[in-house]
């Protein structure tokens, strides 16, 4: 119904009030629900109302505002501290101890986070985003610096329908359209061979407890697994001679092991040259990601931090030991 300059929606009536014409909903079930657009954020509950905007939000603390969009810091919450002597003793021994796997304890001194003590260091959200990995979207954490809220704002994240088939045919130089989707890793870019690469700045340097020959043999699965976590595509970097940058890694024994070594006589060359795993240099190719998503990594810093976040959660399917983001072209180092 028309109400002067004001246009009322279906089911609403025009009421002339002292402050001018207003729309009013006499029976909410006959009107478009303001809740239809899910306006209440951060888990707030929506209640239909008779007056515009036809909803009200009941916010869950610590949020407020008409759409629960405002974060209100609890009054003087003391910063969490890692009080336990137990954790001080266990930190940086190369083993992740769940009792110390907290932000306050630097994720067991980096033992639970691929040696990265603060993956959220660049996250300026008022929320402690590490505590909001909760299978629901928290927009205040949905930034690259806050690791895209662990990709929890992607709507219902789909799973790859033909996962086994797509895994077997990933990056095999043959385009399988049934696998050419974000959730299936864009078929390892098999369907985008004619498109120009779109490389993120920097290099991911990962240490994984698999010898080079085994890692290279399993490279497609390895790249697919990490690409799935990062929602983009990865490839092994090549050096100036065109060789894949996968090198034997001899291990950096932890402080615990160094201490142990000093207490007994080592045999000549004992375990010194034994290959513990591989050091692999990876690049991110966003050529498909940028077409389907606005959650792509422009550089490898946040990608490294997201892998560390997955390590904290225990959701890595490969024995990664450390991850570093290198901005410059790396020398071949062990």
């Amino acid at each position: 119904s028309s109400c002067g300059q004001v246009k009322c929606r279906k089911g609403e009536q025009c009421v002339h009030t002292a402050s001018g014409p207003r729309c009013f909903c006499p029976s909410p079930r006959d009107c478009e629900s303001g809740c239809a657009s899910s306006p209440c954020q951060h888990g707030g509950s929506c209640h239909p109302q008779r007056q515009p905007p036809y909803y009200s939000c009941q916010c869950a603390p610590p949020f407020s505002g008409s759409r629960c969009e405002l974060y209100t810091a609890p009054p003087s919450t003391p910063p969490a501290t890692c009080l336990s002597q137990y954790c001080a003793d266990k930190a940086r021994d190369g083993v992740c101890d769940e009792a110390c796997n907290s932000h306050a304890c630097q994720w067991d001194g980096g033992d639970c986070s691929l040696t990265m003590e603060n993956p959220w260091a660049n996250c300026s959200s008022p929320l402690p985003c590490w505590d909001y990995i909760n299978n629901q979207c928290d927009e205040l954490c949905n930034t690259v610096e806050c690791l895209f809220d662990n990709f929890e704002c992607q709507g219902n994240s789909k799973t790859c329908k033909y996962d086994k088939y797509c895994a077997d045919h990933f990056k095999d130089n043959h385009c399988d359209q049934g696998c050419n989707s974000e959730e299936c890793g864009w078929d390892g870019l098999d369907c985008a061979a004619d498109q120009p690469e779109n490389l993120a700045e920097g290099t991911l340097v990962i240490v994984v407890l698999m010898p080079p020959e085994q890692l290279l043999q399993d490279a497609r699965s390895f790249l697919r697994a990490l690409g799935t976590l990062l929602h983009t595509n990865l490839r092994i970097k090549r050096d100036s001679q065109g060789e894949l940058m996968v090198y034997p890694y001899y291990g950096e024994k932890s402080a615990a092991m160094k201490k142990q070594r000093m207490t007994r006589r080592s045999l000549p060359g004992e375990q010194e040259q034994e290959v513990a795993g591989s050091k692999v240099f990876l690049e991110i190719d966003n050529r498909q990601c940028v077409q389907d998503s606005d959650h792509c990594f422009k550089n490898t810093d946040a990608a490294a931090a997201l892998l560390a976040s997955h390590a904290i959660q225990g959701t890595l399917s490969y024995p990664l030991v450390s991850v570093v983001s290198e901005s410059l072209t790396p020398e071949r180092t062990q």
Partner: antibody
Framework: EVQLVESGGGLVQPGGSLRLSCAAS????????MSWVRQAPGKGLEWVSY????????YYADSVKGRFTISADTSKNTAYLQMNSLRAEDTAVYYC???????????????WGQGTLVTVSS | DIQMTQSPSSLSASVGDRVTITCRAS??????LAWYQQKPGKAPKLLIY???TRESGVPSRFSGSGSGTDFTLTISSLQPEDFATYYC?????????FGQGTKVEIK
């Protein structure tokens, strides 16, 4: 097939020493933590010690700290438990068991050896 | 150390019965709890980890639930091969401690 085989058990006098071995096969030995768990005759299970072969980090139960030493030889895919100053209460079947979660001590033990009996008696 | 208290310590049941074993931790262990089955003269076998995830190859009649301090192992329909001793174990904090065990016997 992932397999753990213990050896080295036997009869020893109180105050004596014994070294148990646990030979692992069928998986990447360096990648997974290993624990020793014991069971006294007719009793329940008791966790004894843990090692992460990659970093060499070790953990012990208070009841064995200072007397037992866990170690690993990654070239032989074998974990060891060196037991010194043995007491009658150390009599038990000793099992080695692999942790399921790579570098996480906070993971369940998914593969167990058959056990080796250690008897401490005069 | 975290104490784990299992109950009952033993129970008698018949084939086809529904059996429930409980385990209580002396402090919050989140969901870092495993259940093991052990038969006489054999090594323990992992049934459940993460409080409720069945280990691969374990029959669906075994289920686990709980978080924090209170946990349950349920065998929905007891089979002849299920007569054994069951242990819970917390792996949240070292030393990892076991419950004292529950022996499931034939009635």
């Amino acid at each position: 097939e992932v397999q753990l085989v213990e050896s080295g058990g036997g009869l020893v006098q109180p105050g004596g020493s014994l070294r148990l071995s646990c030979a692992a096969s069928g998986y990447s030995f360096t990648s997974y933590g290993m624990s020793w768990v014991r069971q006294a005759p007719g009793k329940g299970l008791e966790w004894v010690s843990y090692i992460y072969p990659y970093s060499g980090a070790t953990y012990y139960a208070d009841s064995v700290k200072g007397r037992f030493t866990i170690s690993a030889d990654t070239s032989k895919n074998t974990a060891y438990l060196q037991m010194n100053s043995l007491r009658a209460e150390d009599t038990a079947v000793y099992y080695c068991a692999r942790h399921s979660g790579y570098y996480r001590i906070s993971s369940a033990m998914d593969v167990w050896g058959q056990g080796t009996l250690v008897t401490v008696s005069s | 150390d975290i104490q784990m208290t299992q109950s009952p310590s033993s129970l008698s049941a018949s084939v086809g019965d529904r059996v429930t074993i409980t385990c209580r931790a002396s402090q919050n262990i989140k969901r870092f709890l495993a259940w093991y089955q052990q038969k006489p003269g054999k090594a323990p076998k992992l049934l459940i980890y993460g409080a409720s995830t069945r280990e691969s190859g374990v029959p669906s009649r075994f289920s686990g639930s709980g978080s924090g301090t209170d946990f349950t192992l349920t065998i929905s329909s007891l089979q002849p091969e299920d007569f054994a001793t069951y242990y819970c174990q917390q792996y949240y904090r070292s030393p990892h401690t076991f419950g004292q065990g529950t022996k499931v016997e034939i009635k």
